[in-house]
Interface confidence: low
């Protein structure tokens, strides 16, 4: 899954956790990265890249504790890294990459973390202890489980799947900008000797933002845009702005070579070597940088910033974005990539512009209506009362508002027409000497899951349309499917007739059009994340989990899912855990997540599995995983033997002992049994979980599970006197399945 | 329950060093922060720097950098500081503060009772 | 750093009446929906004590006389009703931003 910088999953936690079983396996090459935060007013386990290593805070009740990867381990290197955190029996154990690199002893008591899992990053999460935790993760989560429940399902629609390409994507790969609300953040851009931006620019947007660099104190900034076609660039500093334009228009689709450069004199800005200056008045000064250098668009706060000033340089769509891209991208002299962003929205590696679309002037005299509104309109407060001047023909007596507004019904997925009953003028028309065709409406923000479709040559770029187009159905609302139930659009209404009304007509009136979306229920469907081929080792079993199928199913939750395995129940290799032996042709999507059936292949052949999925009124289609049986490879990964001192006890770690096998994603049983005598000692195992103080065993076998938990030793137990150092040849045969590899 | 026990007072010399110490008990010394702050005869309060004990990780305010030395031993759960080339402005009394988990970066919640450093020829 | 202003420096009041204390930030305090602002109490002779933190938040063991309020870079702390024992300087404190910083402190005075 790809998380771009600002987002982030949550996952709720039904009851406290005892035991944690954390694996996670990420790459990102920013060196701050919040991975993991389960959350309690007090309590809390924070998992984060900082200066590129991994902190693990653990908070029980009024203790902390904190593990760390070594400061010479950098994790933020873009390669996939997996991490184990356990705690078990009051001890925890961090292990990234298969080493163990830090464990402790923690207090005994359940984790309380009613709030839940946070997933890449903390959304709105205002708690105290979040202070000073790293940025959310820009980077890719590969795989995340708690206790064997998958963290990743479901995804959220800003949440990708998989990994997206610009997180690999080189200094000379292009920041693609593919509207309409792109925005790629960077490190903040210093200015303080002199600062310097350039860039390779490709668009065809007449207005947009380009950068935007806020300041220490309150107002000041640096913003450059495409205003009307050409370059400009503002700054703001303290009570001074300074605003430059360059004459060589940009928005024609060609690569256009773009230099910013600033220092406490002047201001300079150059497009295709062609430069702009201020006078050397010495009015800039140092601009201190707060936050983040934005480029091809704006975050809410610097729209605000922009709204707030004084020259109105609010673009013609605050939220809007450049549409196009930007090439050979330098900041003070450095190159930057799209791998180096903080955050990104709606952006692609490398440069695809779109077409453009069909322009048509007869709306050209209104282009100042389509400003976007702002993020949250306080819903019963539209539109403002209009009170009418003094002097206006009766039909304006008791005048308030132009438009009577009813919900536009649509099933979801499904379009529905905008008509006159909608929009229904509060006032006689042709009375008050208005046609139809001279009420204006602006989209001034559209709905969240659809798009109002103008069948009006030009118009769907501006968003703008008439009353007479309403009633000759030329504006039809088409659903994206999606399951909210309510949705709006925002429309500024205006009216351009040249007879008398009341001036608020003229200015326009903003209206809430409240869209109410009829549920349909969508069926299920199963998916393969990794493919729907499955391998598994010869005479083994192997979980069957969400990683291998799930269902999808935007209107139902997990719970009332249930998988049906389709064929002959008789050698059906699919059982639950706990049923050994026992067919499993039914299953809940619940067991499914819980990790509680295994594929199980006793010889042969390996059986394709045929599922599906039903919601209760709806099945999905049938789905085959194909199963291949692969006979077991075994090979050392590593045996170094053991250096102790005699009478003293060693004990067996992966870093001394493990094979590695031909498993697939597939945990599987690896077998070691001592196969001769020894002669100085005893190897052993350790009984109860491997809790401290349990009692070891003189053992002939143990599994690389048993190593991998700290629960295997060689115990020395040789009372004679030598002069010189013993060996003790220790001889293993280690079985994967039927597999054996013998004389380890 | 949760005492800081400080050091007694230190008469010390302009140029030379003072070492302070603060023992903690009540609670788990290593994963705690622990602050220094300091307090000139009559006036406010001034915040040094904090370390973690755990793992000796530390910050400072910058205008102590270099004036102050935070050190913890998590045997004895007694922090330390050390504040070197002494003048008459670092007379004050110098409290060590438990820093809550809760409230991150830690309101000082339990605090010693000061130890008052007098530079004086 | 974000300095804290303190008002009034010294301020007395009678016994059983209401005591305002006001403290301004050079900039906000605000993060992730709090305010990092906490109020201290320090007699003379001893350490400060916690009384109020994330700006309304009353810490264990304080009397309900003690309330805080406020958000961004304006709070106040507020001790209704006065009592004798309430003699002492108050701090206020924010830790969003490194170095944590004091405001000057206000001296009240029981008549």
């Known amino acids: 899954a790809s998380f771009f910088g600002e987002n982030h999953l949550e996952v709720p936690v039904a009851t406290a956790l005892t035991d944690i079983d954390l694996q996670l396996q990420f790459s990102t090459s920013q060196p701050e990265a919040l991975l993991l935060l389960a959350a309690g007013p007090a309590d809390h386990l924070l998992l984060q890249l900082y200066s590129g290593r991994l902190q693990v805070r653990l908070v029980l009740g009024q203790e902390e504790l904190r593990l760390q990867t070594p400061a010479e381990t950098l994790l933020s290197d873009s390669i996939p890294h997996t991490v184990v955190l356990t705690v078990v029996e009051g001890w925890a154990t961090l292990s990234v990459d298969g080493f163990l690199n830090a464990s402790s002893a923690v207090p005994g008591a359940p984790l309380e973390v009613p709030y839940g899992l946070f997933v890449g990053g903390t959304g709105t999460l205002g708690l105290p202890y979040l202070r000073g935790t790293s940025r959310p993760l820009r980077g890719c989560l590969h795989a995340a489980t708690l206790n064997g429940r998958s963290l990743l399902r479901p995804l959220t629609p800003d949440v990708h799947e998989g990994c997206a390409e610009e997180f690999s994507a080189s200094d000379d790969v292009a920041l693609g900008f593919s509207g309409p609300h792109s925005l790629a953040a960077f490190p903040a851009w210093g200015t303080q000797d002199e600062g310097t931006l350039e860039f390779t620019l490709t668009t065809q947007s007449r207005q947009a933002p380009l950068a935007f660099q806020a300041g220490g104190r309150r107002g000041d900034f640096i913003y450059v845009d495409i205003f009307e076609g050409h370059l400009r660039a503002v700054v703001e500093k303290g009570q001074g702005t300074v605003l430059l334009h360059n004459s060589v228009p940009v928005a024609d689709g060609q690569p256009h070579e773009v230099s910013v450069h600033i220092n406490a004199h002047r201001l300079e800005i150059s497009v295709d070597q062609y430069p702009t200056h201020t006078s050397n008045r010495g009015v800039l000064s140092y601009l201190e940088p707060r936050g983040s250098l934005l480029l091809g668009g704006l975050d809410a706060e610097a729209s605000r910033h922009l709204q707030e000033h004084r020259l109105g340089l609010t673009p013609e769509a605050t939220n809007a974005s450049l549409l196009g891209c930007m090439e050979d991208l330098s900041v003070n002299g450095q190159r930057r990539g799209l791998r180096e962003a903080l955050l990104t929205r709606n952006m692609a590696a490398g440069c695809r512009l779109e077409e453009e679309e069909y322009e048509d002037d007869a709306y050209g005299h209104y282009e100042a209506f389509s400003t976007l509104a702002p993020e949250a309109w306080p819903a019963m407060e539209l539109p403002e009362p209009c009170v009418p001047e003094p002097g206006l023909p009766p039909v304006f007596a008791n005048f308030t508002q132009l438009l009577t507004i009813s919900p536009l019904v649509v099933a979801e997925g499904g379009t529905a027409w905008l008509e006159w009953r909608h929009v229904q003028p509060t006032l006689d028309l042709m009375e008050a000497e208005l046609r139809k065709s001279q009420v204006l409406f602006s989209v001034t923000r559209g709905a969240r899951h659809g798009e109002l479709e103008l069948d009006i040559p030009g118009a769907q770029a501006r968003k703008m349309f008439t009353l007479l187009d309403v009633v000759n159905r030329k504006a039809r609302f088409i659903h994206d499917g999606s399951e909210d139930t309510s949705d709006q659009l925002v429309l500024e209404v205006s009216v351009t007739a040249r007879v008398p009304m009341p001036s608020c007509l003229r200015r326009g009136q903003t209206y809430l059009l409240p869209i109410q979306v009829n549920p349909v229920n969508d069926p299920p469907h199963i998916i393969f994340p990794h493919g729907s081929l499955m391998v598994i080792l010869e005479h083994t079993q192997k979980p069957l989990g969400p990683e291998v199928f799930q269902a999808y199913d935007p209107d139902s939750a997990c719970e009332g899912l249930t998988f049906q395995v389709l064929g002959t129940s008789s050698g059906l290799p699919v059982e639950r855990r706990d049923q050994p032996g026992e067919p499993a042709t039914e299953f809940s999507c619940r067991e499914l997540e819980a990790g509680s059936l295994v594929y199980v292949h006793r010889g042969g052949p390996a059986q394709d599995l045929t599922f599906r999925v039903s919601d209760g009124l709806q099945a999905s289609p049938p789905a085959t995983l194909k199963v291949v049986a692969i006979r077991p490879a075994i090979q050392i990964h590593r045996s170094t033997g053991l250096r102790l001192a005699q009478g003293s006890a060693m004990p067996i770690l992966p870093a001394n002992l493990s094979v590695e096998t031909n498993a697939v994603g597939q945990d599987v049983s690896v077998l070691f049994r001592v196969t001769g005598a020894l002669q100085f000692g005893e190897l052993q195992k350790q009984g109860a979980g491997g809790v401290e103080g349990a009692e070891w065993w003189a053992t002939q076998a143990f599994h690389q599970r048993d190593v991998e938990q700290g629960r295997v030793r060689y115990l020395s137990t040789d009372p004679q006197h030598h002069a010189y150092d013993t060996v003790e040849n220790l001889a293993l045969e280690v079985q994967v399945g039927q597999e054996i590899l013998s004389n380890l | 329950q949760v005492k800081l026990q400080q050091s007694g007072p230190e008469l010390v010399k302009p140029g030379a060093s003072v070492k302070i110490s603060c023992k903690a008990s009540?609670?788990?010394?290593?994963?705690?922060?622990m602050n220094w702050v300091k307090q000139r005869p009559g006036q406010g309060l001034e915040w040094i720097g904090r370390?973690?004990?755990?793992?000796?990780?530390?910050n400072y305010n910058g205008k102590f950098k270099g004036k102050a030395t935070l050190t913890a031993d998590k045997s004895s759960s007694t922090a330390y500081m050390q504040v070197s080339s002494l003048t008459s402005v670092d007379s004050a009394v110098y409290f060590c503060?438990?820093?809550?988990?809760?409230?991150?970066?830690?309101?000082?919640?339990?605090w010693g009772q000061g130890t008052t450093v007098t530079v004086s020829s | 750093d974000i300095e804290l202003t303190q008002s009034p420096a010294s301020l007395a009041v009678s016994l059983g009446q209401r005591a305002t204390i006001s403290c301004r930030a050079s900039?906000?305090?605000?993060?992730?929906?709090?305010?990092?602002m906490h109020w201290y109490q320090q007699k003379p002779g001893q350490p400060p004590k916690l009384l109020i933190y994330?700006?309304?938040n009353l810490e264990s063991g304080v009397p309900a006389r003690f309330s805080g309020s406020g958000s961004r870079t304006d709070f106040t702390l507020t001790i209704d009703p006065v009592e004798a024992d309430d003699a002492a300087t108050y701090y206020c404190?924010?830790?969003?931003?490194?170095?944590?910083?004091f405001g000057g402190g206000t001296k009240l005075e029981i008549k």
């Open positions: 900039e906000s305090v605000d993060s992730y929906g709090n305010s990092f």
């Open positions: 370390i973690y004990p755990g793992d000796g990780d530390t």
């Open positions: 404190q924010q830790n969003n931003e490194d170095p944590l910083t």
């Open positions: 009540g609670y788990a010394f290593s994963r705690s922060w």
């Open positions: 503060a438990r820093g809550n988990t809760v409230v991150v970066p830690y309101t000082m919640d339990y």
């Open positions: 994330l700006a309304s």
